[in-house]
């Protein structure tokens, strides 16, 4: 029975040109975590396997590092990485978790302007 | 249970378009997931057509990007598959499909036989 | 594209043998690979994704294995009822690609 939840950051924001970090967490659950797919809808950014290590995709290499930890930090950030971003929990012996990030990514000048009015 | 079930003609005249509606039960196809249209030609080679996201994007195979058109009915629980320009090299199964992001595609509709000729 | 080549288009095999299919990818696909059967008059099953992962349901007889770009699908203990066509398919990247096929004849 999977009785695990993973959480998320959720909804996030970041200014073009910037970095973010996709960062998942899996809780409430002893199973082990073999492999962590990061996924957009119709393509794989990267996979962390315990075995093999870290993959990243080639249309990602340049601007996309393994880490913290499980997560995965996007550089660069262009308008067109707005968008939904997936990471996949492989578990043994529960099966498979899948976590959900909105990321929006603003124009400079907007992100600043957005900034000043969040509330704390 | 999810279940997907395909209906349209069974016959289709070469450079009409063939139109396909996929019937989901058990599931609300604006929920989560992409909903996927694929075909087995006569022997059995699959190809992946496109799909449409629950939130409403579609992406499709490049090599029928100038001819396909994936829509919803979401107060029916619809997709459709639209092919224009057909010929006898489109003559297929066409299964509705459902993908989960890291899996595949886990759920598929029975299929249905679509032949083009005049 | 990617393609995805199953460089047997059929294999024979005895029930309670092992049997193994093969699917190699045009370029690496780190784990991205599924594996799914056809029964005759039937729409493909998914059995196996991330190149090993047995999805819901499945029988612990069916295995998979691979990274990069060489892939492995096997049957231990093959049963009367493994009569099918198995086929990889990459989910990597779309276009999302299969392979030709492999159909499993039992003796």
């Known amino acids: 029975m999977m009785t695990g939840t993973i959480e998320t950051t959720g909804n996030i924001s970041a200014e073009k040109g910037g970095s973010i970090i996709l960062q998942c967490h899996l809780s409430s659950t002893t199973a082990q975590v073999t492999q962590v797919n990061w996924e957009q809808q119709d393509q794989l950014l990267a996979i962390c396997n315990a075995d093999l290590g870290w993959h990243i995709s080639p249309s990602f290499k340049d601007r996309v590092a393994p880490g913290p930890g499980l997560g995965l930090t996007l550089q660069s950030l262009t308008v067109n990485d707005t968008g939904e971003y997936f990471c996949i929990y492989h578990t043994y012996p529960d099966g498979t978790y899948t976590g959900r990030i909105f990321l929006e990514v603003l124009e400079s000048s907007v992100a600043e302007h957005g900034a000043r009015f969040q509330i704390p | 249970d999810v279940q997907l079930q395909e209906s349209g003609p069974g016959l289709v005249k070469p450079s009409q378009s063939l139109s396909l509606t996929c019937t989901v039960t058990?599931?609300?196809?604006?929920?989560?997931?992409?909903w996927n249209w694929i075909r087995q030609f006569p022997g059995n080679k699959l190809e992946w057509m496109g799909y449409?996201?629950?939130?409403?994007?579609?992406n499709y195979n490049p090599s029928l990007k100038s001819r396909i058109s994936i829509t919803r009915d979401t107060s029916k629980n619809h997709f459709f598959l639209q092919l224009n320009s057909v010929t006898a090299e489109d003559t297929a199964t066409y299964y509705c499909?459902?993908?989960?992001?890291?899996?595949?595609?886990?759920?598929w509709g029975q299929g249905t036989l679509v032949t083009v000729s005049a | 594209d990617i393609v995805m080549t199953q460089s047997h288009k059929f294999m024979s095999t005895s029930v309670g043998d092992r049997v193994s299919i093969t699917c190699k990818a045009s370029?690496?696909?780190?784990?991205?690979v599924a594996w799914y059967q056809q029964k005759p008059g039937q729409s493909p099953k998914l059995l196996i994704y991330?190149?090993?992962y047995r999805y819901t349901g499945v029988p612990d007889r069916f295995t998979g294995s691979g990274s990069g770009t060489d892939f492995t699908f096997t049957i231990n203990s093959v049963q009367a009822e493994d009569l099918a066509v198995y086929y990889c398919?990459?989910?990597?990247?779309?276009?999302?690609?299969f392979g030709g096929g492999t159909k499993l004849e039992i003796k």
């Open positions: 991330s190149a090993s």
């Open positions: 499909a459902r993908r989960q992001v890291g899996l595949g595609f886990a759920y």
């Open positions: 370029q690496d696909v780190s784990t991205a």
């Open positions: 449409i996201v629950y939130s409403g994007s579609t």
């Open positions: 058990g599931y609300s196809i604006t929920s989560d997931y992409a």
């Open positions: 398919q990459q989910h990597y990247s779309s276009p999302w690609t």
